[in-house]
């Protein structure tokens, strides 16, 4: 791989607390690091067909670290796509231009030296402009395995023309079965996207009991589908301490 | 080479409807392109009016949205705009032109003029 | 809406530098593309993708893009090259695309 400049050309302030070199002494080694990591908190990239994909991983280290790119964990080669593609090393970028649908997947940005290795996915989907199902950033919601007491936040990201209704769910028991008569599983509604909800995509739970363990969902629907994603939260208390009861209302997922 | 070429009226009425199309030659517009119209009021700088893709899908400037309608007929490898309750503001060199991210193909442009 | 800035007017005496601006929120992580308009012409692209020269440009045309502001740079000014520059880019938030207002090049003597 060709080295990038050291410089980041997306780096306005000049905040690095490496030491400058001097003619005697030799840079002290730093580990690769995000440079703009705020540039990067967008993962789930939704794109119509033909336009131009850039992904950007802007980093530093020392010695200058080497920049590569994977397409769903595996390594990405210019012929693996028609047209190829560009890697702008001077800018840590990656460019696909005129996208087609075969373009979707997980792009994976690897930054490494000697002294370490960072690494960060792009989502990218290839979509028509015209209404669609609703898409979800993968991976999220996030597992989280919290102390009992604590407040817990579940985030769902989601792209979706027309405007999605959003809900928030848990998998419950009823009767010791966590599954209805009808072979669907029992659920609770949590939260549900109002007209103006604007927090919708996160759940927050507050001051977490043992009870509250379990898989939480994440429900996206439009009038064209649905999507949903879960997670699984996790509260650790002391041995000693009793079981809180449990309160429900049982609905049924379908 | 694509080539692109207005055609229609250059006087249309206030309150009235502008309707142009693009005949494309050299190219299928059916190809992995987007079909755009883009307008220049004299002496002034360049507008996106919309676009669209082979399949019907559209997207429209917003703030000319609720006049225009972008149409797209394969069998004749042309596209069409209509702009309606046109005024005097509307008087502009109406261009053509191909597109990805970038546009890479323009027709020669077509003046039109809004006046009673 | 997504705005791209300009300055209006950039001079340049033959055969010095000229560098038009846009600038726009975080531009550096959107696909700058830049176009010459000659009067009563058609606009034709010389930088697309930030800083590629569609075939048959002059490599005296360059781009470059970073943080807030996209640059053009025309080194070795000819009178030629007198037109108004515009830049574009599709914002991928709103899924328009926009042009900058436009820069008139005017090469001096």
């Known amino acids: 791989d060709a080295l990038p400049s050291s410089e980041d050309d997306d780096d306005d302030d000049d905040s690095s607390s490496e030491e400058k070199e001097t003619d005697n002494t030799k840079p002290n080694p730093v580990a690769p690091y995000w440079t703009s990591p705020e540039k990067m908190e967008k993962k789930l990239h939704a794109v119509p067909a033909a336009k131009t994909v850039k992904f950007k991983c802007p980093s530093s280290g020392t010695p200058n670290p080497t920049l590569r790119w994977l397409k769903n964990g595996k390594e990405f080669k210019p012929d693996h796509r028609i047209g190829g593609y560009k890697v702008r090393y001077a800018t840590w970028s990656i460019i696909m231009d005129s996208v087609v649908p075969s373009d979707k997947g997980n792009y994976t940005c690897i930054v490494e030296n000697e002294y370490g290795s960072i690494n960060h996915t792009y989502q990218l989907d290839v979509v028509e402009r015209s209404p669609h199902r609703p898409i979800l950033q993968a991976g999220l919601p996030a597992n989280k395995t919290v102390a009992l007491g604590s407040n817990v936040e579940f985030m769902c990201k989601v792209y979706s023309d027309p405007q999605p209704h959003i809900q928030w769910l848990k998998h419950i028991e009823v009767n010791g079965s966590k599954i209805g008569p009808d072979n669907l599983p029992y659920v609770q509604i949590l939260k549900h996207s109002g007209i103006n909800s604007s927090d919708a995509e996160v759940l927050t739970l507050f001051n977490v009991t043992e009870a509250q363990s379990g898989e939480y969902v994440c429900k996206v629907s439009n009038y064209i589908g649905e999507a949903n994603q879960s997670a699984w939260l996790t509260v650790t208390r002391p041995a000693l301490e009793e079981r809180p009861a449990v309160m429900t209302s049982p609905l049924y997922l379908e | 080479q694509v080539q692109l070429q207005e055609s229609g009226p250059g006087l249309v009425k206030p309150s009235g409807t502008l309707s142009l199309t693009c005949a494309v030659s050299?190219?299928?517009?059916?190809?992995?392109?987007?079909w755009s119209w883009v307008r220049q009021p004299p002496g002034k700088g360049l507008e996106w009016i919309g676009e669209?893709?082979?399949?019907?899908?559209?997207s429209y400037n917003p703030s000319l949205k609720s006049r225009v309608t972008i149409s797209v007929d394969k069998s004749k490898n042309q596209f069409s705009l209509k702009l309606s309750s046109v005024t005097a503001a509307d008087t502009a060199v109406y261009y053509c032109?191909?597109?990805?991210?970038?546009?890479?193909?323009w027709g020669q442009g077509t003046l039109v003029t809004v006046s009673s | 809406s997504y705005v791209l800035t300009q300055p209006p007017s950039v001079s340049v005496a033959p055969g010095q530098t000229a560098r038009i601006t846009c600038g726009g929120n975080n531009i550096g992580s959107e696909s700058v593309h830049w176009y010459q308009q000659k009067p009563g012409q058609a606009p034709v692209l010389v930088v697309y993708d930030d800083s590629d020269r569609p075939s048959g440009i002059p490599e005296r045309f360059s781009g470059s893009n970073s943080g807030n502001t996209a640059t053009l740079t025309i080194s070795r000014v000819e009178a030629g090259d007198e037109a108004d520059y515009y830049c574009q880019v599709w914002d991928s938030t709103s899924d328009h695309r926009v042009f900058g207002g436009g820069t008139k090049l005017t090469v001096l003597g």
């Open positions: 669209i893709y082979h399949s019907g899908s559209t």
């Open positions: 050299g190219g299928s517009i059916s190809s992995n392109n987007w």
């Open positions: 032109a191909r597109a990805t991210d970038w546009f890479d193909a």
